[in-house]
Amino acid sequence: MKVLQEPTCVSDYMSISTCEWKMNGPTNCSTELRLLYQLVFLLSEAHTCIPENNGGAGCVCHLLMDDVVSADNYTLDLWAGQQLLWKGSFKPSEHVKPRAPGNLTVHTNVSDTLLLTWSNPYPPDNYLYNHLTYAVNIWSENDPADFRIYNVTYLEPSLRIAASTLKSGISYRARVRAWAQCYNTTWSEWSPSTKWHNSYREPFEQH
């Protein structure tokens, strides 16, 4: 049994880091493998993560962690029984993938303006809370070419757009994701999408 693709890990900068790797053949990750992780500080002990399968030869492990600080560094040991398959380390603050925003809502009752709001996925005492910016993706269910991205570079988790920038009388979907420039994070996963029917009064044409 060998590791084909070494573990790579990302942290949500809150309580979970996710590590993924590939073995050289089909593996029952939960019965055959264990990932031990230990914070490199005095009096710390190793914790055990039981991996799950992620495709035939792929494994994924969700490591429980404390609130992350930039000084945190973990040793990682991947074991198959008594055999050490791989040894590495992981600094959560250098591999951050934010949590996905939630509760995306489209408010269509504000004259001819669409107001999209969502929730910041972090509590106020988390460092990322005040450092997230967002991308909102809106697309038409009828027309695959009608696909747009709005970058929200301010902190407020909301976006206002004129309903008239979208076609009237058809259904649209929206989703949102987040990233934090301060930690050069990757983008979060997209939030679940929400659907609405876009309709607005066309202005009278003057002839």
């Epitope: 914070l39 490199v40 500080f41 005095l42 009096l43 710390s44 002990e45 914790h47 429980l64 404390d66 600080v69 000084a71 945190d72 560094n73």
Partner: antibody, heavy 117, light 112 residues
């Protein structure tokens, strides 16, 4: 909210024994090292002992090795300190503390041990 | 064992004014990753100690930002930018590099 509540202190004669307890709540007890720190009346803080999350590793300051024993019961979320061969100079408030990143992130209110005849 | 030495022993302060406490260790507390294994604690009168600063300069959650830690190696400083009446108590430094964990003797901060 993390809570640590010490108990078991009291008056004991020189040469006597006592067992201190620390009941923990508000966090996953077995994931953390925990420690005892004491403070003699009017004096500074003195580290006594610590124990790893699983209970497999214990640590003591030299002056307490052989007389004091640290242990934990993760099923009861409780830390213990067995004090034997007590001396007058062991009179102190004994605090338990949750350890993170090597330091003491949360403290109990303390329990007073008085060694006197 | 690592010996921790604090100064001054006592520090009379005026509310609104800055204050600083020094802590020196008998050996370097700087570890390989570039972080200093030093904590600062405050014990208010009649209370348990509380963590203020960890790893030399990281402020613990819930601690007002008027508290800051600096220094590296063997020389460390705790600064209070503007002292408030509630800051009175005894301040301790502690090294977390190795066991036995050792504290400084404490600095008593009191209002003038």
């Amino acid at each position: 909210e993390v809570q640590l509540v010490e108990s078991g202190g009291g008056l004991v004669q020189p040469g006597g024994s006592l067992r201190l307890s620390c009941a923990a709540s508000g966090f996953t007890f077995s994931r953390y090292a925990v420690s005892w720190v004491r403070q003699a009346p009017g004096k500074g803080l003195e580290w006594v002992s610590a124990i790893g999350g699983s209970g497999g590793k214990t640590y003591y300051a030299d002056s307490f090795k052989g007389r004091f024993t640290i242990s934990r019961d993760n099923s009861k979320n409780t830390l213990y300190l067995q004090l034997n061969s007590l001396r007058a100079e062991d009179t102190a408030v004994y605090y338990c503390a949750r350890v993170l990143r090597g330091g003491f992130w949360d403290w109990g209110q303390g329990t007073l041990v008085t060694v006197s005849s | 064992d690592i010996v921790m030495t604090q100064s001054p022993l006592s520090l009379p302060v005026t509310p609104g004014e800055p204050a600083s406490i020094s802590c020196k260790s008998s050996q370097s507390l700087l570890e390989g990753q570039g972080y200093n294994r030093l904590d600062w604690y405050l014990q208010k009168p009649g209370q348990s100690p509380q963590l203020l600063i960890y790893l030399g300069s990281f402020t613990a959650k819930g601690v007002p930002d008027r508290f800051s830690g600096s220094g590296s190696g063997t020389d460390f400083t705790l600064k209070i930018s503007r002292v408030e009446a509630e800051d009175v108590g005894i301040y301790y430094c502690m090294q977390t590099l190795q066991t036995p964990l050792t504290f400084g003797g404490g600095t008593k901060v009191e209002i003038k």
